[in-house]
C-alpha cells in the first residue's frame, strides 16, 4: 500500500461480534449490484488478533493448499509465503501444485517498516468460506522478507483488494478481485465487517476469536443497522475518498478541507490506526486533549507509544470525545458523517505486568502520506466497496463496540459546498506514488 508507515497490517482488532443488534431502519439507498440479503456462508469468515490484521482462509493450487491470508484494501498484490520462515507454520509449496505456472518474473515490495520479494506465477485459488468458485489468479510467491510476517499472527500471505494501478511490479499485473470478477459471474462488489475486540484478548481467546466478515459479491443486511451512505471513489488506485469536514465532539476543526486529504484519503483494512496528515493530527490531538482534560495523559500516550490503564471495567469512556469525519456524498453539495467512539480509537492491549487492568493505546497517529481510515475507523462500520458503481458505503456495524450512552453513527445528509476543492491533486512530477510503506 502506498504506505506512509504501514506494515503488513497495522492493527486490526479482532474478536467476537459484540454489541447489540439495533432495530433495522428502512433502506433508502438505490438498488445495489450483486446479491442482496443473506450470505450465510461468508459471515464470520474473518479472524485476527489485535493489531495484527484480519485474515480469511484461502486455498491455492492443486491439490488445494490452505493458507490464512490478510485482507488488505490498501494494496493490490496477492502474495503468499512460499519458503520456510521462522514465523510461518505453513507456506505455499509451488512444486506440489500441478496447476502452478511460473511467470518468470520477480517482484519487490517495500513498506516503510517491512519488505518482501518473490516470484510471480499463477495458480488456482478459492475461498472456502466465500463464493463457490475457483479462479486462476496472479500470485507473488514470497521467497525473502524482512519485518513483514508477524510472529504469532496466524496469517501467511496478503490479499491486496485495491486496484491494478498500485500493483507491483506494475499495473499490468491483474489483482485477485479483478480476476475473480472477470472469470465468474460474481458482481464487482465486496463488503467488510471488521469486529474489534473491545477488550484485551489473551493468547487463547485471540486465536479462537471471530474477527468479522468479508462478503464477496454483495451486501449482507444482518451485518449493519440503519442505512448505507455512499461516498464516491475519487480515483481507482487505492480506495481514495474525500473528507470534507472533521469534528471532535461536534466541534469543527475548521481547517481548509484540502488538509484532510493531503495527499490523499484512503480506506485501508491493512492499517491499524486512523492516520491523519501532520497538521490535522496536531489539531485533532489538541482538541481531543481538551475534551478529555479531566484526566491527564503523558505525551507518549498521544504519540501511540505509551499505554494508559484503568482498573478492570472502569475505563472512563465518557471523558473521551467522539470523532466525526464528513465524507463527500453522492449528490452535489451533499455530505454525510461517520462518527467513531473512543471504543474504536483507544485500542485494547494486554499489559503483562498489570493483567487485572484494562490497558489501551491511542490509535490515532500521524501520517506523511495522507489520511488512512484503518481498522480503527472500519471497526465501527460495515463498509461496502462497490467497485461497480465506484463508491464506498458506510453503515453502523452490528458488531461495533459501544456503551449504553453512545454508539457509532452514520448520519446525513448535510449541505456542504465546493467539496471538489477538498481533493488534493498530486503533481504529475511527484514520484512519491512509486514508494510503498505503511503502518
Amino acid at each position: 500500500t502506498h504506505l506512509g508507515i504501514r506494515l503488513p497490517l497495522r492493527s486490526g482488532l479482532a474478536g467476537p461480534p459484540l454489541g447489540l443488534r439495533l432495530p433495522r431502519e428502512t433502506d433508502e439507498e438505490s438498488e445495489e449490484p450483486g446479491r442482496r440479503g443473506s450470505f450465510v456462508e461468508m459471515v464470520d469468515n474473518l479472524r485476527g488478533k489485535s493489531g495484527q490484521g484480519y485474515y480469511v482462509e484461502m486455498t491455492v493450487g492443486s491439490p488445494p493448499q490452505t493458507l490464512n491470508i490478510l485482507v488488505d484494501t490498501g494494496s493490490s498484490n496477492f502474495a503468499v509465503g512460499a519458503a520456510p520462515h521462522p514465523f510461518l507454520h505453513r507456506y505455499y509449496q509451488r512444486q506440489l501444485s500441478s496447476t502452478y505456472r511460473d511467470l518468470r518474473k520477480g517482484v519487490y515490495v517495500p513498506y516503510t517498516q517491512g519488505k518482501w520479494e518473490g516470484e510471480l506465477g499463477t495458480d488456482l485459488v478459492s475461498i472456502p468460506h466465500g463464493p463457490n468458485v475457483t479462479v486462476r489468479a496472479n500470485i507473488a510467491a514470497i521467497t525473502e522478507s524482512d519485518k513483514f510476517f508477524i510472529n504469532g499472527s496466524n496469517w501467511e500471505g496478503i490479499l491486496g483488494l485495491a486496484y491494478a494501478e498500485i500493483a507491483r511490479p506494475d499495473d499490468s499485473l491483474e489483482p485477485f478481485f479483478d480476476s475473480l470478477v472477470k472469470q465468474t459471474h460474481i458482481p464487482n462488489i465486496f463488503s467488510l465487517q471488521l469486529c474489534g475486540a473491545g477488550f484485551p484478548l489473551n493468547q487463547t481467546e485471540a486465536l479462537a476469536s471471530v474477527g468479522g466478515s468479508m462478503i464477496i459479491g454483495g451486501i449482507d443486511h444482518s451485518l449493519y443497522t440503519g442505512r448505507l451512505w455512499y461516498t464516491p471513489i475519487r480515483r481507482e488506485w487505492y480506495y481514495e475518498v474525500i473528507i470534507v469536514r472533521v469534528e471532535i465532539n461536534g466541534q469543527d476543526l475548521k481547517m481548509d478541507c484540502k488538509e484532510y486529504n493531503y495527499d490523499k484519503s484512503i480506506v485501508d483494512s491493512g492499517t491499524t490506526n486512523l492516520r491523519l496528515p501532520k497538521k490535522v493530527f496536531e489539531a485533532a490531538v489538541k482538541s481531543i486533549k481538551a475534551a478529555s482534560s479531566t484526566e491527564k495523559f503523558p505525551d507518549g500516550f498521544w504519540l501511540g507509544e505509551q499505554l494508559v490503564c484503568w482498573q478492570a471495567g472502569t475505563t472512563p469512556w465518557n471523558i473521551f470525545p467522539v470523532i466525526s469525519l464528513y465524507l463527500m456524498g453522492e449528490v452535489t453539495n451533499q455530505s454525510f458523517r461517520i462518527t467513531i467512539l473512543p471504543q474504536q480509537y483507544l485500542r485494547p492491549v494486554e499489559d503483562v505486568a498489570t493483567s487485572q487492568d484494562d490497558c489501551y493505546k491511542f490509535a490515532v497517529s500521524q501520517s506523511s502520506t495522507g489520511t488512512v481510515m484503518g481498522a480503527v475507523i472500519m471497526e465501527g462500520f460495515y463498509v461496502v466497496f462497490d467497485r461497480a458503481r465506484k463508491r464506498i458505503g458506510f453503515a453502523v456495524s452490528a458488531c461495533h463496540v459501544h456503551d449504553e450512552f453512545r454508539t457509532a453513527a452514520v448520519e446525513g445528509p448535510f449541505v456542504t459546498a465546493d467539496m471538489e476543492d477538498c481533493g488534493y491533486n498530486i503533481p504529475q512530477t511527484d514520484e512519491s506514488t512509486l514508494m510503498t510503506g505503511r503502518a
Epitope: 519458503a83 520456510p84 518468470r104 518474473k105 520477480g106 517482484v107 519487490y108 517495500p110 519488505k115 520479494e117 518473490g118 516470484e119 521467497t143 525473502e144 524482512d146 511490479p169 506494475d170
Partner: antibody
Framework: EVQLLESGGGLVQPGGSLRLSCAAS????????MSWVRQAPGKGLEWVSA????????YYADSVKGRFTISRDNSKNTLYLQMDSLRAEDTAVYYC?????????????????WGQGTLVTVSS | EIVLTQSPATLSLSPGERATLSCRAS??????LAWYQQKPGQAPRLLIY???NRATGIPARFSGSGSGTDFTLTISSLEPEDFAVYYC?????????FGGGTKVEIK
C-alpha cells in the same frame, strides 16, 4: 574495501564435476545477494545463477538448470557453485559478483563489484 | 527469454567525440536495465543501473536513458580510458540476459 576471490576452476572432462568458491571480504556477506556470471573465451557475458542474501531464493539460467547448484555459507563469507554434468559449452571464465542489497529485485540492487574470475575448461 | 540486441556491434570514434550505444529488448523490461563496461583482461564494472542512474564513482559524461524496450547509453565526450566493450543487461524476467555487447574502439 570489498574483495571477491574466485577459486576452484581448472580442467575437467565432459560429464565431470567442479565446485567453485568465492571468498568475500570487506562487507557483511549475509546482507547481500550474490551472483555467478560467465564469459566464454572471446564471447560476451552470460548470467548463470543468483541467490538472495539469506540463500532462501536461488535462480538459474535455463542452460545450467538441473546441473549447477548455487549455495552460500554466510558464516564462512563464501559463495559456491557446484557444477555437475559439465559440457564443453560450459568452458568460460566464471565471475562472482556482489548484489546491491539482500534483495534480488529491489531497484538499484545490481551486481557490482565482480571478482577477477576463475577459468573452467571442459575438454577431453 | 528476453533477447537484448545491442547496436552497433562496433563503434569507431576518436577521443572527445560523443558515443551513442543502443540496446533494444524483445519485450518490455520497464527500467530494469543496467550497463556494464569491460576492458580486456578485467572484470565488468557497473556504469548505469535502473536505466538512467549513474553508479557510484562513475563520471558524469556517462548517461543512460530509455524505458520499456529501447535504451541508450551516451558518453558525451570520449576519454582514452572509455574505449572498451559495453554490455546491457536486464533483470525484469528470468533468465536475466545480457546483450551481445558494443565495442567502442579508437578510430
Amino acid at each position: 574495501e570489498v574483495q571477491l576471490l574466485e577459486s576452484g576452476g581448472g580442467l575437467v572432462q565432459p560429464g565431470g564435476s567442479l565446485r567453485l568458491s568465492c571468498a568475500a571480504s570487506g562487507f557483511t556477506f549475509g546482507s547481500y545477494a550474490m551472483s555467478w556470471v560467465r564469459q566464454a573465451p572471446g564471447k560476451g557475458l552470460e548470467w548463470v545463477s543468483a541467490t538472495s542474501g539469506s540463500g532462501g531464493s536461488t535462480y538459474y539460467a535455463d542452460s545450467v538448470k538441473g546441473r549447477f547448484t548455487i549455495s552460500r555459507d554466510n558464516s564462512k563469507n563464501t559463495l559456491y557453485l557446484q557444477m555437475d554434468s559439465l559440457r564443453a559449452e560450459d568452458t568460460a571464465v566464471y565471475y562472482c559478483a556482489k548484489g546491491g542489497s539482500q534483495w534480488l529485485y529491489a531497484p538499484g540492487s545490481w551486481f557490482d563489484p565482480w571478482g577477477q574470475g576463475t577459468l573452467v575448461t571442459v575438454s577431453s | 527469454e528476453i533477447v537484448l540486441t545491442q547496436s552497433p556491434a562496433t563503434l569507431s570514434l576518436s577521443p572527445g567525440e560523443r558515443a551513442t550505444l543502443s540496446c533494444r529488448a524483445s519485450q518490455s523490461v520497464s527500467s530494469y536495465l543496467a550497463w556494464y563496461q569491460q576492458k580486456p583482461g578485467q572484470a565488468p564494472r557497473l556504469l548505469i543501473y535502473d536505466a538512467s542512474n549513474r553508479a557510484t564513482g562513475i563520471p558524469a559524461r556517462f548517461s543512460g536513458s530509455g524505458s520499456g524496450t529501447d535504451f541508450t547509453l551516451t558518453i558525451s565526450s570520449l576519454e582514452p580510458e572509455d574505449f572498451a566493450v559495453y554490455y546491457c543487461v536486464q533483470r525484469s524476467n528470468f533468465p536475466w540476459t545480457f546483450g551481445g555487447g558494443t565495442k567502442v574502439e579508437i578510430k
